[in-house]
């Protein structure tokens, strides 16, 4: 089995308030099966941003067509960015189970929010 890796190519992304932020994430294997989730922050206080298994998440859309059976791109777009959205975003693969368990995390992408241009 090829070992699954999670690639978040951007260490940081800067977006003006009111615009959309694209956070990139690709995986290198479909296995083990289980959902992808995005979180802002780490540890117990982290905030769920997107869960492939649930929805909807009104401000979040996937960039690629995740209903393709071979899809490995789980990049997301977050609309109408505000300063409250600043933080480090992690793309995390969960392994199926009762409950699903965290399997592997990307390195994270730091989102910074610039003031809206006047």
């Amino acid at each position: 089995e090829e070992e699954l890796q999670i690639i978040q190519p951007d260490k940081s992304v800067s977006v003006a308030a009111g615009e959309s932020a694209i956070l990139h994430c690709t995986i290198t294997s479909l296995f083990p099966v289980g959902p992808i989730q995005w979180f802002r922050g780490a540890g117990p206080a982290r905030v769920l941003i997107y869960n492939q298994r649930q929805g909807p998440f009104p401000r979040v859309t996937t960039v690629s067509e995740t209903t393709k059976r071979e899809n490995m791109d789980f990049s997301i777009s977050i609309s109408n960015i505000t300063p409250a959205d600043a933080g480090t975003y992690y793309c995390i693969k969960f392994r199926k189970g009762s409950p699903d368990t965290e399997f592997k995390s990307g390195a994270g992408t730091e989102l910074s929010v610039r003031a809206k241009p006047s």
Partner: antibody, heavy 118, light 107 residues
Framework: DVQLVESGGGVVRPGESLRLSCAAS????????MSWVRQAPGKGLEWLAG????????YYIDSVKGRFTISRDNSKSSLYLRMNSLTAEDTAVYYC???????????WGLGTLVTVSS | ALTQPASVSANPGETVKITCSGG??????YAWYQQKSPGSAPVTVI????ERPSDIPSRFSGSASGSAATLIITGVRVEDEAVYFC???????????FGAGTTLTVL
């Protein structure tokens, strides 16, 4: 409420073609992958084909590859199955089904009966 | 191919377990589909191994471990009489498969 209504079934002769339709309502059709499943008289369920939400990717069981074509029109919330070179073995009730995030099925249509007989 | 018993019987109020084997836990998700009569529309009672649709009674539950999945009906009722098909999606092949079905008789 999610509703899936198949149509287009009927009696055809061996070698003829048929196009089945499935009208979807009660959900955002363009966000879901869809599939066709059939059940021959007195037999179990057999998955035939699936299509991604945007329609760009299709998947088939080997026994119908090249003979059946799955397609969709998101503007009409409709799913289709074109069946060519039909044989008696294709006699079955044909169901359309909505896929879950991991390509299982959560909602089914009532089915349409296809009879291939000379 | 997925393998399940041809038939199971139980008295009302008993707990019924139907097993389905043949998938790879690493690459397969399971579901359970109820069909009350041949040719009628199947109803999904469990998908994603253990997820119950909101309109399905809580007496239906599911689990999966190793190469098998299990449908559990706790406190079975006469109206649960049906054929139950296990289904699987294999991420290696991109193919959906079904078991041959288990006929549940409630005595």
């Amino acid at each position: 409420d999610v509703q899936l209504v198949e149509s287009g079934g009927g009696v055809v002769r061996p070698g003829e073609s048929l196009r089945l339709s499935c009208a979807a309502s009660g959900f955002t059709f363009s966000s879901h992958a869809m599939s066709w499943v059939r059940q021959a008289p007195g037999k179990g369920l057999e998955w035939l084909a699936g299509i991604s939400a945007g329609g760009s990717d299709t998947y088939y069981i080997d026994s119908v590859k090249g003979r059946f074509t799955i397609s969709r029109d998101n503007s009409k919330s409709s799913l289709y199955l074109r069946m060519n070179s039909l044989t008696a073995e294709d006699t079955a009730v044909y169901y359309c089904a909505r896929e879950t995030w991991n390509h299982l099925f959560d909602y089914w249509g009532l089915g349409t009966l296809v009879t291939v007989s000379s | 191919a997925l393998t399940q018993p041809a038939s199971v019987s139980a008295n009302p109020g008993e707990t019924v377990k139907i097993t389905c084997s043949g998938g790879d836990y690493y690459s397969t998700y399971y579901a359970w589909y109820q069909q009350k009569s041949p040719g009628s529309a199947p109803v999904t009672v469990i998908h994603s191994d253990d997820e119950r649709p909101s309109d399905i009674p809580s007496r239906f539950s599911g689990s999966a471990s190793g190469s098998a999945a299990t449908l559990i009906i706790t406190g079975v009722r006469v109206e649960d009489e049906a054929v139950y098909f296990c289904g699987g999606y294999d991420g290696r092949t991109y193919i959906n498969t079904f078991g041959a079905g288990t006929t549940l008789t409630v005595l």
